[in-house]
């Protein structure tokens, strides 16, 4: 069976197909979750949709083989198998990993440590997001690009305010926050 | 008529390896999922591994994942069960099943006992 | 995993009498995706009933099975001398497929 991987935002309507045509005159054709767990099964001229977690919000489109879901959530993260039961009695299958993400929300940038050293303002921020496994990516008047959730900087004696945007993002969104200071070692904005 | 006939069980040591065979007729193979059922001595039924009919995907109950490999050839007509690491409550009669259309097993083929002690 | 549970254990019984089985599911079962099986001493299991209802090929109408939801019953209309058996039940609602421990139908 050939593997294909899918990331979408949930919440979002989700076509899963195959990018090849189906065999000619298939006998049957059923979508599964799981191994054996059926969405619906086409035979015999009729769809029959399956008491599941799917039920109503799905939809089988017989001639491509394209399974169509409605609003779909984090619960919904599974490895789906199109199974098709050939003219010659023999069975070819698909299968589409479907990764469901959040969107990102809004980080916090918090202030860890921020003190004058030598006329130097020393700041140590954090970009916090509850519980996601996201990238995180610092822009800004910084040295190089930093991609942690932390970012540790030092700056010199400046007349402007600097400002640093931490980008979180995952495969589906991204989110921006922004902290500024204001000379010599003051947090003005976010 | 549908036949299923297993092979290949017998007396093992703790630790040691096994392969068992099922040889199917009367139908086409290769339409049809496939499932290995074990029993242990006076106890009940055990659902152990299926497979797919195109042999693209397998599952395994909890007890048996990582030591026990379903595999099949459609070419043969043949299902296979290789064990490993072999444990005394592995001790059954293995029986093979078609897995009609991913609901229930049948038929049943006879089953083949593996016994394993030192 | 929904686990099943068979009661009785074990019946005697005498041939021509009636006989109810019964299999509860510790979850709803799925559209009755409920399955019975005989098995004679020696013997591989046999598909009696598929659906909760519907009687596998050549299985003869005194067996018949009922239920829907947790609460499922096989139910032999006039035992016949072979159908003293171990019957078991299974799902397939949910994964894993899973069986009951099984109810003995035994002469008494």
């Known amino acids: 069976g050939r593997l294909v991987h899918m990331t979408v935002v949930s919440g979002s309507n989700v076509t899963l197909n195959i990018s090849e045509s189906l065999p000619e005159n298939y006998k049957q054709l059923t979508w599964f979750y799981t191994f054996d767990q059926k969405i619906v099964e086409w035979d015999s001229g009729k769809s029959k949709y399956f008491e599941s977690k799917f039920k109503g919000r799905v939809r089988l489109d017989p001639q491509s083989g394209a399974l169509y879901i409605s609003k779909v959530q984090k619960e919904d993260n599974s490895t789906y198998v199109m199974r098709v039961l050939k003219k010659d009695g023999y069975e070819q299958e698909w299968k589409i990993k479907l990764q469901v993400l959040d969107p990102v929300p809004k980080p916090v940038i918090k202030i860890e440590k921020r003190e004058d050293v030598d006329d130097n303002c020393y700041l140590k921020l954090s970009c916090v997001i509850p519980g996601e496994s996201v990238n995180y990516t610092w822009y800004g008047e910084l040295p190089k690009e930093i991609q942690n959730s932390v970012l540790e900087t030092t700056l010199k004696p400046h007349k402007h305010s600097r400002c640093y945007t931490c980008q979180v993002s995952n495969s589906v969104s991204s989110k921006n926050g922004t902290f500024c200071f204001s000379p010599p070692c003051t947090a003005a904005r976010s | 008529e549908v036949q299923l006939l297993e092979s290949g069980g017998g007396l093992v040591h703790p630790g040691g390896s096994l392969r068992l065979s099922c040889a199917a007729s009367?139908?086409?193979?290769?339409?049809?999922?496939m499932s290995w059922v074990r029993q242990a001595p006076g106890k009940g039924l055990e659902w152990v591994s299926l497979?797919?009919?195109?042999?693209?995907?397998?599952y395994y109950a909890d007890s048996v994942k990582g030591r026990f490999t379903i595999f099949r050839d459609n070419s043969k007509n043949t299902l296979y069960l290789q064990m490993i690491s072999l444990r005394a409550e592995d001790s059954a009669v293995y029986y093979c099943?078609?897995?009609?259309?991913?609901?229930?097993?049948?038929?049943w083929g006879q089953g083949t006992l593996v016994t394993v002690s030192s | 995993e929904i686990v099943l549970t068979q009661s009785p254990g074990t019946l005697s019984l005498s041939p021509g009498e009636r006989v109810t089985l019964s299999c509860r599911a510790s979850?709803?079962?799925?559209?009755?995706?409920l399955a019975w099986y005989q098995q004679k001493p020696g013997q591989a299991p046999r598909l009696l009933i598929y659906?909760?209802?519907s009687r596998a090929t050549g299985i003869p109408d005194r067996f018949s099975g009922s239920g829907s939801g947790t609460d499922f019953t096989l139910t032999i209309s006039r035992l016949e001398p072979e159908d003293f058996a171990v019957y078991y039940c299974?799902?397939?609602?949910?994964?894993?497929?899973?069986f009951g421990q099984g109810t003995k139908v035994e002469i008494k």
């Open positions: 659906g909760a209802s």
């Open positions: 497979i797919s009919g195109s042999g693209g995907s397998t």
């Open positions: 009367g139908f086409t193979f290769g339409g049809y999922a």
């Open positions: 099943a078609k897995y009609s259309n991913y609901d229930y097993f049948d038929p």
């Open positions: 979850q709803s079962v799925s559209s009755s995706y």
């Open positions: 299974q799902q397939y609602g949910s994964s894993p497929r899973t």
